[in-house]
């Protein structure tokens, strides 16, 4: 058993039918002695009697408020939150997989620069009694601080018969380096709570590893004099970081038809215009990726060729 | 080229092998995110690489103020990755395919390791660990962690020579 | 005491369905995930699919997978496994078991036998 | 797929002899196996899991070590209730079950 916050405790329970569970004592926070009474949840039944509660927790009936009272007034309450290991592997009921980039993912980061600044989401098909706490470092033996906001619900989707529910955070490294080669990874470590259950979920990356321009932005497009080429010239995003003589991006240009099935010219440029043939119906879009560390690709910014 | 004494290096030649060393880094080990190299073990064998830390002066301003400290740190890194692409690590098995990038890439970190400091002139280097893994398994999981780290090494590498191939040439 | 049962098996035809069942007692069957397991006539064990508690997660062997269909329904402490296109390679003792991956209380198994 | 191969497949021996079952994973699992018995005609049952933590109310002659690719099942002295097939599974990523490895009277 250990203490997540004040007054509210995790018991580690392996998770099998007929598992002994964990014992657990309990201790009233008062100076009283004599005449102290156990209660828990909503229920009026006395458990027990004495500034100790020894209970065995085995199921979730066994979670909850444990409160200790003297003469109808409430002295002080311990809430159980159950933590469940199943064969070995702490359970993650509350959190979806989002398989990407594989198996057993859960936490998903992004950052769109150098600086330090990075978002995380993640997924759950649970809509109520539902709670998160975020804490991040640089490194975990001897951690460098990460300042995390707290978890908002950003999204909701309908799949399916299923509703899902994305829930996002923004954290800073607080002393962040961007032109320094990273040598510890950054871990996130996210508590979630639904009810009496506790789950952590944990993330560890290098911010190089998670970058993802914005799109290149004021993407325009200068027709060519007696022909069919034009001239797409845009710049970088505003919040890529700067100098961009350090902080270089490369640029796929892409040509598309209407069709999703015709034909699509790609030219690869580090510089921020290219000339390419303008067919009719066709859209130019542009994306942008690191030069120099092949983190992932923007999103495409687009115009119509007419 | 970059001498103890601090004349520049040959900031354009840099930057264009620099940026080859980037993409023989990334053709040579290409599965980023396909195998998560800190969930496995063997975490010493790619601590005693040498970073480009906060305090070795390759960001800009400290570039401008004086790029030897950056170079220099530069330069271990590169004799470093070096030696350890030269090593049993890489040369033994299982056996390199043919045409694997591995050998250009280690013949690029020479040449540019050269453009950095001519004959003669020595920065101190880094001592390389003793690395010699006893399984084929083990060999193959160290060559992928050696250019994982390689990838980030030569990324800042690049940054810093397109910097001044920009901003610091005569 | 723990107990899990299962019912449902029998002989079928190539290509044809079975749904076995497995009935739960002796613990509080919602909370914990379970498992098939199982042992072609002669052979070693292999693993089918496993369940959450919930119902919410479930995973399957290749060997099985878009064929078999794993469910539950907590409210009638009952595990299912529906078993489409069978095949003769299919032919064995089904256990159903707790866990996803350690069992520890199996049941007695029932014989399913795929054959024209 | 993960592959577990037991050996031996077959082993002869009297009561009160130590026996040894090996389990090889064809890459690095942990320590993340389990052991179960199988008498004639009854449902397995699990003796080991983690590698080497004896399930409770299993006698302690039963006893499993080992982690990476090689793990092993020693029973330290045979008795006449374990005469049976012993299988190894692995749970580092899906569920795999060695071969099996049936331990008969000599």
């Known amino acids: 058993i250990w203490e997540l916050k004040k007054d509210v405790y995790v018991v580690e329970l392996d998770w099998y039918p007929d598992a002994p569970g964990e014992m657990v004592v309990l201790t009233c926070d008062t100076p009283e002695e004599d005449g102290i009474t156990w209660t828990l949840d909503q229920s009026s039944e006395v458990l027990g009697s004495g500034k100790t509660l020894t209970i065995q927790v085995k199921e979730f009936g066994d979670a909850g408020q444990y409160t200790c009272h003297k003469g109808g007034e409430v002295l002080s309450h311990s809430l159980l939150l159950l933590h469940k290991k199943e064969d070995g592997i702490w359970s993650t009921d509350i959190l979806k997989d989002q398989k990407e980039p594989k198996n057993k993912t859960f936490l998903r980061c992004e950052a769109k620069n150098y600086s330090g600044r990075f978002t995380c989401w993640w997924l759950t098909t649970i809509s109520t009694d539902l709670t998160f706490s975020v804490k991040s470092s640089r490194g975990s033996s001897d951690p460098q601080g990460v300042t995390c906001g707290a978890a908002t619900l950003s999204a909701e989707r309908v799949r399916g018969d299923n509703k899902e529910y994305e829930y996002s955070v923004e954290c800073q490294e607080d002393s962040a380096c961007p032109a320094a080669e990273e040598s510890l990874p950054i871990e996130v470590m996210v508590d979630a709570v639904h009810k009496l259950k506790y789950e952590n979920y944990t993330s560890s990356f290098f911010i190089r590893d998670i970058i993802k321009p914005d799109p290149p932005k004021n993407l325009q497009l200068k027709p060519l004099k007696n022909s069919r080429q034009v001239e797409v010239s845009w710049e970088y995003p505003d919040t890529w970081s700067t100098p961009h003589s350090y902080f270089s991006l490369t640029f796929c240009v892409q040509v598309q038809g209407k069709s999703k099935r015709e034909k699509k010219d790609r030219v690869f440029t580090d510089k921020t215009s290219a000339t390419v043939i303008c067919r009719k119906n066709a859209s130019i879009s542009v994306r942008a990726q690191d030069r120099y560390y092949s983190s992932s690709w923007s999103e495409w910014a687009s115009v119509p060729c007419s | 080229r970059a001498v103890p004494g601090g004349s520049s290096p040959a900031w354009t030649q840099c930057q264009q092998l620099s940026q080859k060393l980037c993409t023989l880094a990334w053709s040579a080990h290409p599965l980023v995110g396909h195998m998560d190299l800190r969930e496995e073990g063997d975490e010493e064998t790619t601590n005693d690489v040498p970073h480009i830390q906060c305090g070795d002066g390759c960001d800009p301003q400290g570039l401008r103020d004086n790029s030897q400290f950056c170079l220099q740190r530069i330069h271990q890194g590169l004799i470093f990755y070096e030696k350890l692409l030269g090593s049993d690590i890489f040369t033994g098995e299982p056996s390199l395919l043919p045409d694997s990038p591995v050998g250009q890439l280690h013949a690029s970190l020479l040449g540019l390791s050269q453009l950095l400091q001519p004959e003669g002139h020595h920065w101190e280097t880094q001592q390389i660990p003793s690395l010699s893994p006893s399984q084929p398994w083990q060999r193959l999981l160290l060559r992928f962690k050696i250019l994982r780290s390689l990838q980030a090494f030569v990324a800042v590498a690049a940054r810093v020579f397109a910097h001044g191939a920009a901003t610091l040439s005569p | 005491e723990v107990q899990l049962l299962e019912s449902g098996g029998g002989l079928v035809q190539p290509g044809g369905s079975l749904r076995l069942s497995c009935a739960a007692s002796?613990?509080?069957?919602?909370?914990?995930?379970m498992s098939w397991v199982r042992q072609a006539p002669g052979k070693g064990l292999e693993w089918v699919s496993s369940i959450r508690s919930s119902g919410g997660r479930t995973d399957y062997a290749d060997s099985v997978k878009g064929r078999f269909t794993i469910s539950r329904d907590n409210s009638k402490n009952t595990l299912y496994l529906q078993m489409n296109s069978l095949r003769a390679e299919d032919t064995a003792v089904y256990y159903c078991?707790?866990?996803?991956?350690?069992?520890?209380?199996w049941g007695q198994g029932t014989l399913v036998t795929v054959s024209s | 797929d993960i592959q577990m191969t037991q050996s031996p497949s077959t082993l002869s021996a009297s009561v009160g002899d130590r026996v040894t079952i090996t389990c090889r994973a064809s890459q690095n699992i942990g320590t993340w196996v389990v052991w179960y018995q199988q008498r004639p005609g009854k449902a397995p049952s699990l003796l080991i899991y983690k590698a080497s933590t004896l399930e409770s109310g299993v006698p302690s002659r039963f006893s499993g070590s080992g982690s990476g690719t090689e793990f092993t099942l020693t029973i330290s002295s045979l008795q006449p209730d374990d005469f049976a097939t012993y299988y190894c599974q692995q749970f580092y990523t899906s569920k795999t079950f060695g071969q099996g490895t049936k331990v008969e009277i000599k």
């Open positions: 078991a707790t866990g996803i991956a350690v069992a520890r209380y």
């Open positions: 002796g613990f509080t069957f919602s909370n914990y995930s």
